[in-house]
Amino acid sequence: GPVWRKHYITYRINNYTPDMNREDVDYAIRKAFQVWSNVTPLKFSKINTGMADILVVFARGAHGDFHAFDGKGGILAHAFGPGSGIGGDAHFDEDEFWTTHSGGTNLFLTAVHEIGHSLGLGHSSDPKAVMFPTYKYVDINTFRLSADDIRGIQSLYGDPKENQRLPNPDNSEPALCDPNLSFDAVTTVGNKIFFFKDRFFWLKVSERPKTSVNLISSLWPTLPSGIEAAYEIEARNQVFLFKDDKYWLISNLRPEPNYPKSIHSFGFPNFVKKIDAAVFNPRFYRTYFFVDNQYWRYDERRQMMDPGYPKLITKNFQGIGPKIDAVFYSKNKYYYFFQGSNQFEYDFLLQRITKTLKSNSWFGC
């Protein structure tokens, strides 16, 4: 059967059931995707506009495919296997009463099953499997995939990367030369490159092999761990650091007062809740903000977003995307994009990838 031929998969909730709070729907769907990402290399991200790989729809009766719903009971939901268009989409019967608990029909449990189909799984004959064709409530707090579910999904996608399976529970220093190492954010700061991961950053001084690891809090005690995006405007000695919907300004390596501020002051629409990566290009005096599978371009002189954005990353950065973890600018012509444990040297003048590297290639591993 079909499978997704990529590991970054986007989903979008088209509309919400009135049976539940929107936040509870978001949470149930997010946790359902997490069930599958925990046992595979797949990464799921929610987008709020544009074309997602997997569209989540609540509908009743005839709703745009051949498989009309049948009212309360009976068919609860259905999902299409991987593919373009309707491929991957998951439809939930609005005539059911969707809940967060054992009453009605539990959305999380149903979504885990349907997302299994969205990823290419068929039904299981094991009654303990979530992919068994009939719905049965189990305690969602202790819910686990069966061995059969795990075998099935890993036969399609493999098992998770080491750094996913071992999520650094005690926040100990990540192994710098782990081939699966990924970064949260990367930026130049003068002649140095800062690589952020969890509560740490590595400092790489250009052209020198030595790298040092530091706690973010040791340099900037007022900043949080888990920085998600960063960029530098070298001419102003400014570094911008992002986490969730907030950003901090660092001037001459010192945090500015009156921060953090909301990312929406840059002009992002309300649905943008966090920035994945950011990079400033001094040639154009523009900053590129990457959010899920899209990017915005910000004019640092006029202090406003350029019109015509967001655009799809894959459309305008050939071979990059659909989603990235980090990016920085170097040598006057390259962006270095990070996707998981891989890194791509991208010549923005030629508009193509010129080298593929491991993310930790800067450290002489």
Epitope: G1, G64, D65, F66, H67, G81, G85
Partner: antibody, heavy 122, light 103 residues
Framework: EVQLLESGGGLVQPGGSLRLSCAAS????????MHWVRQAPGKGLEWVSG????????FYADSIKGRFTISRDNSKNTLYLQMNSLRAEDTAVYYC???????????????WGRGTLVTVSS | DIQMTQSPSSLSASVGDRVTITCRAN??????LNWYQQKPGKAPELLIY???SLQSGVPSRFSGSGSGTDFTLTISSLQPEDFATYYC?????FGQGTKLEIK
């Protein structure tokens, strides 16, 4: 190269029966939904019926429900449409169409046959 | 039940013109809309699926847009071979068709 070749059309009297066949080649037939779509002379396209990969489920347009039966033989890579109680308004070119999907059908037809003409007239 | 309304039913245009055909559903069909081209005596051919995705081999002058209930097919610069009938379709429902003729 994907090919769909319809046969079995012809002239039949009202109330009569015909069985259309569609021979598929150039792709693995069994995983895909298959459909019949018709077009009356000088008119638009009308979806008639669809069938799932293993012979079910089956769906029918209201206009032919109870009179036509869709079936398939995956071992022969062939789709069928049994048409009973034919009426003058069933006169049309009947096309066989391959769906892009298996499991569930979204109704996206990526390949079509050339059609076979069914004429219902006394 | 879902219904599709296509307009106009016929259209006269010249080579090089930009042409737009619209299709409206009576309820949301998300992006589950396809467009087909049919020439006289031939079977229909898939042009665009999922509202805006160009089928492999179809010239880039064809484009589709829309979601929910309103959709459009645009031909940016008509070529002689584009004079045909165009149908929108969603699952088992086709629009009435738009016949595109030479002016």
């Amino acid at each position: 190269e994907v090919q769909l070749l319809e046969s079995g059309g012809g002239l039949v009297q009202p109330g009569g029966s015909l069985r259309l066949s569609c021979a598929a080649s150039g792709f693995t037939f069994s995983p895909y939904w298959m459909h019949w779509v018709r077009q009356a002379p000088g008119k638009g396209l009308e979806w008639v019926s669809g069938i799932g990969p293993s012979g079910g489920p089956t769906f029918y347009a209201d206009s032919i429900k109870g009179r036509f039966t869709i079936s398939r033989d995956n071992s022969k890579n062939t789709l069928y449409l049994q048409m009973n109680s034919l009426r003058a308004e069933d006169t049309a070119v009947y096309y066989c169409a391959k769906d892009i999907r298996g499991a569930y059908s979204g109704g996206l037809f990526d390949y079509w046959g050339r059609g076979t003409l069914v004429t219902v007239s006394s | 039940d879902i219904q599709m309304t296509q307009s106009p039913s016929s259209l006269s245009a010249s080579v090089g013109d930009r042409v737009t055909i619209t299709c409206r559903a009576n309820q949301s069909i998300y992006t589950y809309l396809n467009w087909y081209q049919q020439k006289p005596g031939k079977a229909p051919e898939l042009l665009i699926y999922a509202a805006s995705s160009l089928q492999s081999g179809v010239p880039s002058r064809f484009s589709g847009s829309g979601s929910g209930t309103d959709f459009t097919l645009t031909i940016s610069s008509l070529q002689p071979e584009d004079f045909a009938t165009y149908y929108c379709q969603q699952a088992g429902i086709f629009g009435q068709g738009t016949k595109l003729e030479i002016k």
